[in-house]
Structure formats: C-alpha cells, structure tokens
C-alpha cells in the first residue's frame, strides 16, 4: 500500500486529515463518487472540534457529509459507529420527511446554514466536503 504524508494541492490539513471543500453542488451519490476517486470519503464528523472546523470553512451553506441511512440505519461512510459517535442534528431531525413531493423520504445528512445537521433528499445538488486521513496506508487490491 501507499501512504499519504501531505495533503494534495488545494486541500486543507487539519488534525492529520486533509479536507477539500467544493464550490459547486452535486447529488450525494455523485459527491461520494467524487471523493472516492480522490482516495477520500465524504467528511465524517467525529468531534465538536471537527464540526467547528468544517463549519468555519463551509459557511452558512447546505453541504453534504458522509452520513446516510439509505439502507436502513444511519451509517458513516468510513464505518465510524453512528450510535456511539458525535451527533449534531437540528431539533426534531432527522425526520425522514416525505412531504417534499420528490418521492421517498430523506436519507442523506447535510450541514445546514447554522452548521447543525438535517436529513434531506439525496438528489439535491448541495456542496460537499471530502476528507482523507494522513499517514494511513491505503490498501491496494491484489492484481488478478
């Protein structure tokens, strides 16, 4: 495997992770793919300190994070445990609201204008944040 020791150009280093903040919007799945092609993942918020860091960089703009419940329970994209982990939902969220008229509920989490989290329709074109950890050996699949 290879090890990343410094952040790519235009990524921001913070607490041994690299972050990339988009300036345009994508559906959640497209944002997830974008991060994965860069050997990263949608941001996983594990502490109040990280929450404040991300919030400072994104400003008051709806922004996707790496949290969804498209397969049932809420899950972080990197496998971080949701139940025991950091949460910052808005009051009465997540609510899986069906009243938007777009079909289905709300399965993807985003930062709202005040930084707190909301669940929303995954197809909405929100900005997003990619994150990758420094000094973490990336696993290369065996060649067949």
């Amino acid at each position: 495997g290879s090890e990343r020791t410094c952040c790519p150009v235009n990524w921001v280093e913070h607490e041994r992770s690299c972050y990339w903040f988009s300036r345009s919007g994508k559906a959640w799945a497209d944002a997830d793919n974008y991060c994965r092609l860069e050997d990263a993942h949608l941001v996983v918020v594990t502490s109040w300190e990280e929450q404040k860091f991300v919030q400072h960089h994104i400003g008051p703009v709806n922004t996707w994070m790496g949290l969804h419940d498209q397969n049932g329970p809420w899950k972080w994209v990197d496998g971080t445990d949701y139940e025991t982990g950091f949460k910052n939902w808005r009051p009465e969220q997540p609510d899986d609201w069906y009243g938007h008229g777009l079909g289905g509920g709300e399965d993807c989490a985003h930062f709202t204008d005040d930084g707190r989290w909301n669940d929303d329709v995954c197809q909405r074109p929100y900005r997003w944040v990619c994150e990758t950890e420094l000094d973490k050996a990336s696993q290369e699949p065996p060649l067949l």
Partner: antibody
C-alpha cells in the same frame, strides 16, 4: 515528460478474454486517478472505467460492468484492464488517460492520453 | 446518465474563419466540462477544462465558455492544423460521457 503506452490489444473471439496494460512514466503515478476510454472504428469516444490513485476505488460504464476489471500496480507504474466475455461491440481502440483536476472548482479532466491499442472481437 | 449533444455534427470552414461549436448537457453540470481535439489515427488532446480554462500549450485562439447545460468552444481564426474532430466531455457524474463529436473540415 508524461508518457502513457498501451499494449495487449489484438484479435480475440467472442466470449474470450484479453488484458490490456498501460505503462506510465514522467509523473508520480500513484498520486493520480486513471481511466480507460475506447473508440469503436469510425465512432466517438466512450468512457469505460476509472480507478483511484491507490487502486482502492473503481468505477465502470454500465456497458462493461461485470465483464471488465480495472486495476493498477503502483510499484510498476502500470494500469490494467482485464476484459472478459468479450463481445463484437467491444471492438475499439482502447486509450488509457491520466486524470487531473481544476484546482479551483475540482472539475476533473484527462490531460494526457496514450496512443491506444486496438482490440478486435471477431470469430 | 447525462447525455451530451453537439452541434453542428460537422462544419466546413476556411483558414481564418471563426468557428463555434455548441455542446449541451441533458442536465446541469456546473462548469464540469472539457473539450478535446482529435486528429485521424491519433489520441485525443485536451484543449479546455472547467468549461473555460485553457490547457497549457494550447493556442489562445481556442476558447471555451458556458455553465449549467450550454457550452461553446470557439476557434477565433482557424488554422490548417485545426482541421480535426472536437469532443466535449462532462465530468460532473459517472459515467463521464462524451458528446458525439463535431468534425471541422476544409471548405
């Protein structure tokens, strides 16, 4: 100077297999995602597959999903495309391409391409 | 999948002419669009990325514009080496689809 050199093309029967290689030089190979793009004779360009720099994440066009496998060996600076269950419609020149992105918007693009290798699927 | 269309399909022009090619996406792709030039028997060559950024080494007579769904590639004064086929490509979402191409030939 960035160079990409494809090899492994040739004539294969329908249902057969082939493995294409793309030898890269002139840049830090493991730092860049790579793609395969193909072009049927007299036709336009079709994106086939992409792989992240580490090789940990792969992406495919629906037309090849389940039949083609993209991989890379960063110790050898080489990209691969394993093609199984080949069909006549897979006949094309296959190009490997290096992906970069606009540092402001993040918009990806293919800045360097190999010369291509021809795959012909015919009985 | 995002469908890309180009117009015209082909254009006959003379050296010195201004040529404009249009590319349209079936849904908004921000400015996540690239333009490539391809000559017969050769690999594509990147001209424009992020809709309007000129790739290093590409002559300034090439320019790109647009955002959302409608984009254009312009060649301000066609040169003999510009006769080729031009493709647009969206990289907003997988699959990274190309337009069908526009062939620019000699009038």
């Amino acid at each position: 100077e960035v160079q990409l050199l494809e090899s492994g093309g040739g004539l294969v029967q329908p249902g057969g297999s082939l493995r294409l290689s793309c030898a890269a030089s002139g840049f830090t190979f493991s730092s860049y995602a790579m793609s395969w793009v193909r072009q049927a004779p007299g036709k336009g360009l079709e994106w086939v597959s992409a792989i992240s720099g580490s090789g940990g994440n792969t992406f495919y066009a629906d037309s090849v999903k389940g039949r083609f496998t993209i991989s890379r060996d960063n110790s050898k600076n080489t990209l691969y495309l394993q093609m199984n269950s080949l069909r006549a419609e897979d006949t094309a020149v296959y190009y490997c391409a290096k992906k970069d992105y606009d540092y402001v918007w993040g918009s990806p693009y293919f800045d360097y391409w190999g010369q291509g290798t021809l795959v012909t699927v015919s009985s | 999948d995002i469908q890309m269309t180009q117009s015209p399909g082909s254009v006959s022009a003379s050296v010195g002419d201004r040529v404009t090619i249009t590319c349209r996406a079936s849904q908004g792709i921000n400015n996540w669009l690239a333009w490539y030039q391809q000559k017969p028997g050769k690999a594509p060559k990147l001209l424009i990325y992020a809709a309007s950024s000129l790739q290093g080494g590409v002559p300034s007579r090439f320019s790109g514009s647009g955002s959302g769904t409608d984009f254009t590639l312009s060649i301000s004064s066609l040169q003999p080496e510009d006769f080729a086929t031009y493709y647009c490509q969206q990289t907003d979402s997988f699959p990274f689809t190309f337009g069908p191409g526009t062939k620019v030939d000699i009038k």
